[in-house]
Every structure is written in C-alpha cells, then in structure tokens.
C-alpha cells in the first residue's frame, strides 16, 4: 500500500481467483483514543472500533472511503483504491491501446518544435467517475523539471456503437535547450482513477522523436507564362523553431488528381518553392519534416490547381 | 578549415558533408526507431557517447560568439563514432553486407573530421569505451543504439554547419 495523495491510498493486489489479498491497517488521524468507530462509504454499518482498523482487501467491495467517527462527528477519511496485477502485469483497463507506433501504446505525444513544449493524449471509452493526473521529468535518476497542466477532455468521437473520449495535456520543459542533443529522455507518467480502480501509464521519449511540424503556411501558386507549370511557394509554419537557418525543414510537394487512384507526382526540396505541372482538377499539397532528423512529416497544406 | 587556433572552417563543404551524414545515418538503419531495444540483460550501453550539450556553444548565439568550442565538440564526436563504426561492434557478426551504408557512413565521418582538423593539428579526443559484446545479438543491439545516437548527433552537427554556412561564411 502507498499514498497517492493526502488521504488517498493505493493497494496493490495480485488478481487471481481466491487470492489472499492484502492486509491493510488504517489509522484514524485524531488525538482521540476512545469511542472511535469505522464505516465504509455511505453505509452506517460499523466495521470496527478503535483508533486503528485492520482489513483484508481482496476485491473492489473492500475498497472505498473509510471514515472514522466519534459521537456522530467525522474525524478523518482514508480512500482506498485498488491497483490490479494479473499474471505479473499491471492492468490497463482504463485507457485504450492506440497500437501506433506499436502495440501497448496508451499515451501518444507530439511536439511542434524544439522549445521543450509537447502535448500528450490518450483515449478511453469511460465517460464518468474518471480522473487523471500527469507528471513529467527529463530523466529518471536525477530528474530535471517538466511542468504539465491539467488533463482536459479534448475530443469525443463515435466509433461504431461506442463513444470514445480523447484527453490531452500540455507540458513544458522548465529549462529547455533547443539546440542541444538530448541524452536523457522525457518521462511522462499518467495516474488514472476510475471509480475505485487505479492504473498508471508511462511514456518515455526524446523530443526529437516526437517532432511533428505544423503544415507549411501561405501556400500559393503562381502560373508561369506560356506553360502548364506553376511555381508553388510556401513559408515555414509560425510554430517552428527559429532561426530557420539552424532549425531547417525539408518539404515534399505533391500533385494529386481528383481520383485517389491517379498517379501522384512528388518532389522533395529544401527550398520554400518548387515548379510543378498543374493538371486540371488536381490539387497541390506540401508538407514539412525536420531536414536533418527523420521524425514525423507534418499534415499536408493544400491548394486547388484551378 | 577549422584549426585549433581559431580560423574558420569550410562551412559550405562541412554543411554538404554533414547533410550527407544525416542521410547515411538514417539509411544505415531506417527501422531502428521501430525496434524494441529494451532487451533483457541489456545494460545502458550507449551512455558514454559524446553528446552536444547545452554549454557546448553549438546554439546560434554560441556559434556567433565563438564557434571553436562547438567545432571541437563536433570533431570529438566524429572521431568517437568513426572509431566505433570501425570496431568489432560493426565488423563482427552478424556481418554487414559490403554495400551497407555503414561503410560510407564510416568514411564520411572520417572525411568530415579531417575537414575540421587538417593533418598536424590536434584537438584532444575522447577515449573510446571498450565495448566488446560477448554475444552476437548484443553486438546487433549495440549497433542499433549507436546508430540511433549517431542520428541525433549528426542532426545537431548538420544544423550547426547549415547555420554557419548561411550566417558565418566569409
């Protein structure tokens, strides 16, 4: 058993049929010695008396808010949550496996630049009695500070018969050094509590590996005289790190016909313009990627050819 | 050329070669990012590689003030990785095919380090840890980890040379 926060405790249980459970001793936070009784949740049934209460925690029915009273007055509370371990593996019932980039990916994180700011998100089908708390650091043995905000519900989607909820959190490294080569990864820890179930999820990454620039901005076409060619130009996204002579991007320009089956013409360039042939009813799209490190491509910025 | 005394390197040549290094480092192991490198019985094996850190002067401001600190750091790293790529970790089993990009990568690391430090000049270099894996699979794991950190190292070096070529070239 360990303390998650003041008056909230997590009991770690090996979860299998007829498991013995854990013996837990609760102590009433009071100078009083006599006449103390204990109850669980809203029930008025007295579970025991005395300053301490010993219970055998085996299942969710044994978890909840234990309260000690004296003469009708509440003295203190202890909330017990359960953390299940099945076959040596901690349960992951609350969050959905996003399976990208690999199985057992519950948290996904992205950064728009090298400033040390990043966003993480996760999915669940649970809509109520759900709380999240997020902590982060750079490295684990001698951790350097990363400040995370509160997790918020950022999207709701219908997937078949189910509703899916996306939560996200923004974090910022306290003393970020955008130009340095990271040697210690960022660690993100999410505590999830659904009713009386506790779970924790972690992710470890370098900012460089989660970089995904915003799409190029101000995408424009300029027809070239007496030609089917056009000059496409664009600019670095505002959110990208500066100076651009140092934090350079590379670009992919694509000409795509109306039908998805039509052959795509692609050009790769380090410049912020390119000359391409504009077919009727086609569109031109440009996306960006860090020039020197193969992290994710941005989403496409697109304009129609006509 | 960057000489310890402090004259300027051939920024444009260094830029071209460092960009080529980036391409080679990724072609040497594009899969490396998708592999689960947390093998059992695997200690942290690449902690001793030289990293370009915050105080090394490789940021745009530091380069403007005095690029020598940064160039020396990059040179150290290039020599370090060049030695690693020439060691048993990469020459042992499972063997790399003759056309593997690792061979070109090895040569390009040497080429860039020579651009930065011509014959007869000496910057102190970092000791190579004696990493001699006893099992072939550990050698493979080390390769992937080394390539992974090399990808990060050459990305910073390439940024330095690109910025230098754009802003510090005579």
């Amino acid at each position: 058993i360990w303390e998650l926060k003041k008056d909230v405790y997590v009991v770690e249980l090996d979860w299998y049929p007829d498991a013995p459970g854990e013996m837990v001793v609760l102590t009433c936070d009071t100078p009083e010695e006599d006449g103390i009784t204990w109850t669980l949740d809203q029930s008025s049934e007295v579970l025991g008396s005395g300053k301490t209460l010993t219970i055998q925690v085996k299942e969710f029915g044994d978890a909840g808010q234990y309260t000690c009273h004296k003469g009708g007055e509440v003295l203190s509370h202890s909330l017990l949550l359960l953390h299940k371990k099945e076959d040596g593996i901690w349960s992951t019932d609350i969050l959905k496996d996003q399976k990208e980039p690999k199985n057992k990916t519950f948290l996904r994180c992205e950064a728009k630049n090298y400033s040390g700011r990043f966003t993480c998100w996760w999915l669940t089908t649970i809509s109520t009695d759900l709380t999240f708390s997020v902590k982060s650091s750079r490295g684990s043995s001698d951790p350097q500070g990363v400040t995370c905000g509160a997790a918020t519900l950022s999207a709701e989607r219908v997937r078949g018969d189910n509703k899916e909820y996306e939560y996200s959190v923004e974090c910022q490294e306290d003393s970020a050094c955008p130009a340095a080569e990271e040697s210690l990864p960022i660690e993100v820890m999410v505590d999830a509590v659904h009713k009386l179930k506790y779970e924790n999820y972690t992710s470890s990454f370098f900012i460089r590996d989660i970089i995904k620039p915003d799409p190029p901005k101000n995408l424009q076409l300029k027809p070239l005289k007496n030609s089917r060619q056009v000059e496409v130009s664009w600019e670095y996204p505002d959110t990208w790190s500066t100076p651009h002579s140092y934090f350079s991007l590379t670009f992919c320009v694509q000409v795509q016909g109306k039908s998805k089956r039509e052959k795509k013409d692609r050009v790769f360039t380090d410049k912020t313009s390119a000359t391409v042939i504009c077919r009727k009813n086609a569109s031109i799209s440009v996306r960006a990627q860090d020039r020197y490190y193969s992290s994710s491509w941005s989403e496409w910025a697109s304009v129609p050819c006509s | 050329r960057a000489v310890p005394g402090g004259s300027s390197p051939a920024w444009t040549q260094c830029q071209q070669l460092s960009q080529k290094l980036c391409t080679l480092a990724w072609s040497a192991h594009p899969l490396v990012g998708h592999m689960d490198l947390r093998e059992e019985g695997d200690e942290e094996t690449t902690n001793d590689v030289p990293h370009i850190q915050c105080g090394d002067g490789c940021d745009p401001q530091g380069l403007r003030d005095n690029s020598q600190f940064c160039l020396q750091r990059i040179h150290q790293g290039l020599i370090f990785y060049e030695k690693l790529l020439g060691s048993d970790i990469f020459t042992g089993e499972p063997s790399l095919l003759p056309d593997s990009p690792v061979g070109q990568l090895h040569a390009s690391l040497l080429g860039l380090s020579q651009l930065l430090q011509p014959e007869g000049h000496h910057w102190e270099t970092q000791q190579i840890p004696s990493l001699s894996p006893s099992q072939p699979w550990q050698r493979l794991l080390l390769r992937f980890k080394i390539l992974r950190s090399l990808q990060a190292f050459v990305a910073v070096a390439a940024r330095v040379f690109a910025h230098g070529a754009a802003t510090l070239s005579p």
């Epitope: - | 592999m35 689960d36 499972p94 790399l96 699979w137 493979l140």
Partner: antibody
Framework: QVQLVQSGAEVKKPGSSVKVSCKAS????????ITWVRQAPGQGLEWMGE????????YYNEKFKGRVTITADKSTSTAYMELSSLRSEDTAVYYC???????????????????WGQGTLVTVSS | DIVMTQSPDSLAVSLGERATINCKAS???????????LHWYQQKPGQPPKLIYN??KLESGVPDRFSGSGSGTDFTLTISSLQAEDVAVYYC?????????FGGGTKVEIK
C-alpha cells in the same frame, strides 16, 4: 557450385588429438563463416563453434573447455577443427558447414548453415 | 546455456496429414521483440542436416507445406500435408546466444 569436402575417417587413441579439415570451393571463402557440428552415433546434433575469416572472430562452445581449436587458412580456403585430449565419448561424425550470418535492413539477424560437408567419422578407442 | 527442448521425440503421421513439432527454449530467443533467432533443420538418414526454416523465413526451394511459427520461448514447425520424402529427424537450433544449441530432435515417420 558450393562444395565442402572434409578429410577422411580417423581412429584415435584416448588422450590424443585429431585435426579435421574442410576444403571449401565454389564461393568466396572469406565472405562466410565455417561452423563445426558433431553427432555421436544415434544421437542429436551438437554445435562446437565457428570461425569467420573476414572478421577473424571465433566462437566456441565452452563445453569443450579449450579442447577445441577452430582455424581457417584463407590462402587455401580450408577450415580446420582440432580436438585434443580425446575420450571415448568424442566418437562422432564431425560436420563442417558454411555459415552465413548477416544483418540487413530486412533481415537484421539472418543465420544459415546452408551447405554442409559430408562428415568425418572420428572413432576414439583404445 | 539456452536449453532447447523438442516434443514429441517421435511422431507417426499418415500421408497427407498434418505433423506438428514443438520446440521450447529455456530463455527468450527472439531479439527486439520480433526478430527470431530460431531455425529448423531436417536430417535424413546418412545425410548431413539441411536448413528448412530460417528465423521466420522458409528457405528457398523448401516446399510451402512447411511453416514455422512462434516467438519468445515457444516455437512450432508444421508440415501441413506429410509426404513420403518428409520422413526425417527435425532439429531446432537457437543462435541468439553462444553456445548455439540444438533441440534433441523429433523423428517423423509415416503411420
């Protein structure tokens, strides 16, 4: 075509040594390793060790506690396996096999004993 | 050393029927979670062994009735429709750790 031709059968006294040769042809000798595997009469296969002429690396089965020495002569494309301090339980057919152990992007850990010698019967008897 | 345990020791299957051979390692013989360092060899009487399955890949020239599966510590070689020429002893071999080790062999016969 690729061929591995081993030296002939040997009868040895306990305590003595035997040196089995394996002449390779039909491929670039230095580009592959040579593995030695033995098989006692009616028994399974046992890996003894292997040598890679290109890297100069040799891997041994510690079970043989320094009794086995595997070498290769690149000039004659011949591999050798010497086993010393022979005992009766060393009676077996000794095979050499060409070992391809490579790493590519598609196959990061490809290992194949793809061509084998005909085997050399070594009998240890007093 | 990694101990490779094959089961069954011998197997009698009717022509055209499926034959399944198991190989269990005392330690994981996959690398990076997915790359297999487990191989299958076939040995016919009086002949040296022949490689039939390399990691997760069927060797070229080997009939596709042979298939290999498994990861971690448990592996299986399946012959989907046994032919007379498949009568042999089959060995698994791990090359994750030196010394490389063979399983004890499974003798496949026709019922």
């Amino acid at each position: 075509q690729v061929q591995l031709v081993q030296s002939g059968a040997e009868v040895k006294k306990p305590g003595s040594s035997v040196k089995v040769s394996c002449k390779a042809s039909g491929y670039t000798f230095a580009s592959y390793g040579i593995t030695w595997v033995r098989q006692a009469p009616g028994q399974g296969l046992e890996w003894m060790g292997e040598n890679y002429p290109r890297s100069g690396n040799t891997y041994y089965n510690e079970k043989f506690k320094g009794r086995v020495t595997i070498t290769a002569d690149k000039s004659t494309s011949t591999a050798y396996m010497e086993l010393s301090s022979l005992r009766s339980e060393d009676t077996a057919v000794y095979y050499c096999a060409r070992a391809e152990f490579i790493s590519t992007v598609v196959a990061p850990y490809y290992y194949a004993l793809d061509y084998w010698g005909q085997g050399t019967l070594v009998t240890v008897s007093s | 050393d990694i101990v490779m345990t094959q089961s069954p020791d011998s197997l009698a299957v009717s022509l055209g029927e499926r034959a399944t051979i198991n190989c269990k390692a005392s330690k994981k013989v996959t690398i990076f979670g997915s790359t297999s360092a487990l191989h299958w060899y076939q040995q016919k009487p009086g002949q040296p062994p022949k490689l039939i399955y390399n990691g997760a890949k069927l060797e070229s020239g080997v009939p596709d009735r042979f298939s290999g599966s498994g990861s971690g510590t448990d592996f299986t070689l399946t012959i989907s429709s046994l032919q007379a020429e498949d009568v042999a002893v089959y060995y698994c071999l791990q090359n994750k750790e030196v010394p490389y080790t063979f399983g004890g062999g499974t003798k496949v016969e026709i019922k």
